[in-house]
């Protein structure tokens, strides 16, 4: 239950340093004053601290125009020094002073903690004139006080460029404890101690702290604020809050969830974005991180082939982006792919495995036994070769690409021909006489163009000089190609 303290007023303020009490004229001493009109500050001795000069809340008048008598010193009358009240209550306080009628244009201003209060404050000044003096009462009211209204309030009055200052009125707004630091949500390692902090302030002080874990009080005996709770470790998620108690009642902090770090959940939705002959681009959706940031991921690749040895290739990659290009794969092969990710606690299980295939590759070997000879009667060059021994992964042969380069004095021209997969011979027209023709052949599949064969050169003579001897690539292991003319 929240209890309300009785409102009370104390005669003396509760802030550091003693305050002067009522200043009486027999404590004052008149100084020799310069011959100027108006009031001068007087040097006063505080009755609470005899012998210590006190200036600032009285003004002593000079000799009157009649030259016969002194006016009493000007000072604000004493009022209540300390007001204690609860939040949301209304408060009104005032300061009063009697000013001889010979003074005009007296203004009173209110100050809080050294700053003038301007604008929308409820300050009212009332004047009660009499024959010789005018009583001035300055009232200050605050509706529904808040903690921010706490402080030391004073009145200041200016008369003939002199300032008279009242004793302070200290306003203390009391209420339920107010949190300046609350526990915060955390992710912690299982069975590992950690700290939570709670701090609350009044007034009124002291503020005592109780800790609550999953609705059970941790400390039956409270600790004075601030309080640090050492939690000896958790095996499962828990909710913590702290209760702050003072004489006004209690305030409960927000409840914070403390999570236990665990291994992540497996990734989901592994998808294939792009396949080539030797690579596959995949993406995945990360699983729950287990309350601990992902560090990295592992892509696991198994070849799905009864003849393969079933080994798993592992590719480590960063956790973000959730994408990876798997390289160094065989062409036209089937793979099973899974992804696992880790945090500081450990590795997740592997995602559901998905099947993916690489596309056909380009042939890895060139056609064999390339032979070139000149058919002068038709003005052709005949080319023959043997089909290369391509691996299954290279895919189905769709044809050949023939490169023939013609070189004579100062001229070089390369031409490309495509022929179907059923051929193992081709004819090309003679482009230039008295020139060298260099021929290379590559096998072609849907996966691309394979390597070209070693070049075979043949000399094309000027018209009339015939030589039917062919040029050819050597059998494997022989020396460089030879030109036969």
């Amino acid at each position: 239950a929240i209890t309300e303290a009785r409102e009370e007023a104390k005669p003396y303020p509760l802030f550091p340093g003693p305050l002067p009490g009522s200043l009486q004229t027999d404590h004052t001493s008149l100084l020799s004053l310069p011959h100027t009109s108006g009031y001068q500050p007087a040097l006063m001795f505080s009755p609470t601290q005899p012998g210590r000069p006190y200036t600032g809340n009285v003004a002593i008048p000079r000799v009157t125009s009649a030259g016969s008598k002194l006016l009493p010193p000007l000072a604000f009358k004493h009022t209540v020094g300390h007001i204690i009240l609860s939040e949301h209550k209304d408060v009104k306080f005032n300061c009063s002073i009697s000013v001889p009628n010979i003074y005009q244009d007296t203004t009173i201003s209110w100050w809080k903690d050294g700053k003038e209060l301007l604008g929308a404050h409820h300050a009212i000044t009332q004047f009660y004139p009499d024959d010789e003096v005018t009583a001035i009462i300055a009232s200050f009211s605050i509706t529904s006080v808040q903690r921010s209204d706490n402080g030391s309030y004073i009145c200041k009055m200016k008369i003939n460029n002199e300032e008279i200052v009242s004793d302070p009125i200290y306003i203390e707004v009391q209420g339920l404890p107010h949190f300046t630091k609350q526990p915060e949500s955390m992710n912690v390692t299982r069975n590992t101690a950690f700290n939570l902090t709670c701090q609350a302030v009044g007034p009124p002080e002291p503020v005592n702290i109780f800790w609550v874990q999953n609705s059970s009080r941790v400390n039956e005996q409270p600790e004075k604020s601030p309080s640090v709770l050492t939690v000896p470790g958790l095996t499962e998620m828990a909710v913590f809050s702290c209760e702050a108690h003072n004489d006004k009642g209690l305030t409960v902090s927000k409840g914070v969830q403390i999570n236990i770090k665990a291994i992540p959940s497996p990734p989901t939705e592994v998808s294939i974005h792009n396949s080539t002959a030797h690579s596959i681009l995949i993406s995945w959706v990360p699983g729950f991180d287990g309350y601990s940031p992902f560090r990295n991921c592992s892509v696991q690749v198994k070849e799905v082939d009864p003849l393969s040895n079933g080994s798993v290739m592992i590719f480590n990659t960063s956790a973000s982006p959730h994408m990876y290009q798997i390289k160094q794969l065989q062409a036209l092969a089937n793979y099973s792919i899974g992804v696992s990710c880790m945090n500081e606690i450990g590795w997740s299980a592997v995602s559901p495995w998905i099947l993916a295939s690489t596309t056909e590759g380009a042939p890895s070997v060139a056609p064999l036994n390339v032979t070139v000879f000149l058919n002068e009667s038709r003005d052709n060059v005949d080319i023959r070769w043997m089909k290369p021994l391509t691996k299954r992964q290279a895919g189905e042969l769709v044809g050949y690409r023939i490169s023939h380069v013609w070189q004579s004095a100062g001229i070089s021209k390369e031409l490309l021909e495509e022929v179907g997969q059923n051929n193992s011979r081709a004819q090309i027209s003679v482009q230039v006489h008295n020139a060298t023709c260099t021929v290379r052949i590559a096998a072609v599949t849907k996966g691309g163009v394979g390597p070209f064969s070693d070049p075979v050169k043949i000399f094309i003579p000027a018209h009339g000089w015939v030589d039917h001897a062919p040029s050819s690539t050597p059998a494997p292991g022989n020396a460089d190609p030879v030109l036969i003319i």
């Epitope: 069975n191 800790w211 039956e220 005996q221 409270p222 000896p232 470790g233």
Partner: antibody, heavy 118, light 106 residues
Amino acid sequence: QVQLVQSGSELKKPGASVKVSCKASSYTFTTYGMSWVRQAPGQGLEWMGWINTMSGVPTYTDDFKGRFVFSLDTSVSTAYLQISSLKAEDTAVYYCARYTNYGVFDYWGQGTLVTVSS
Amino acid sequence: DIQLTQSPGFLSASVGDRVTITCRASSSVGYMHWYQQKPGKAPKLLIYATSNLAQGVPSRFSGSGSGTEFTLTISSLQPEDFATYYCQQWGSLPFTFGQGTKLEIK
């Protein structure tokens, strides 16, 4: 080294009263609660309740409400257990134990045997 | 009130043995504490908050568990370990103790 030193054994007649003391040393007495635990001969441990050493407010478990009173003298860092209208079934060893967060009894007195016999 | 049941109630073992004592709660508790008591002596805190070794307690003692089932394990019994062991729950007032497990030399 934290120490809780209890008063010596007591032999009392039924209907009498007894007051057991527990003097704490080597820590700030008002920082931790003080619990009382009973162990009847050959039996297990029973938590009787505790006293808030800061406020002096006692809390009793249901079985120990009525004849049992916890009190303090913080000036000498001492907790007391008083049992009135003693019965034969109050015969037991009574322990004081320092009471910390999470209901841990981290330091115990050596125990005081109270025997109630006519 | 939460009831704590220790098993076994009596245990006979030899030096060097590994022994486990179980404490079951009638409903879920936050933490379990364990105490050792030798004849004629006060109980001594052994393990607090389920798995934390109290000051000066040898590492052969360990605790684990959560919810309603908790265990105290002594990895290799030493002659000085023969005593009675009690569990005590935190999580629901009043705090309650198990009935005790007496560990004797075989």
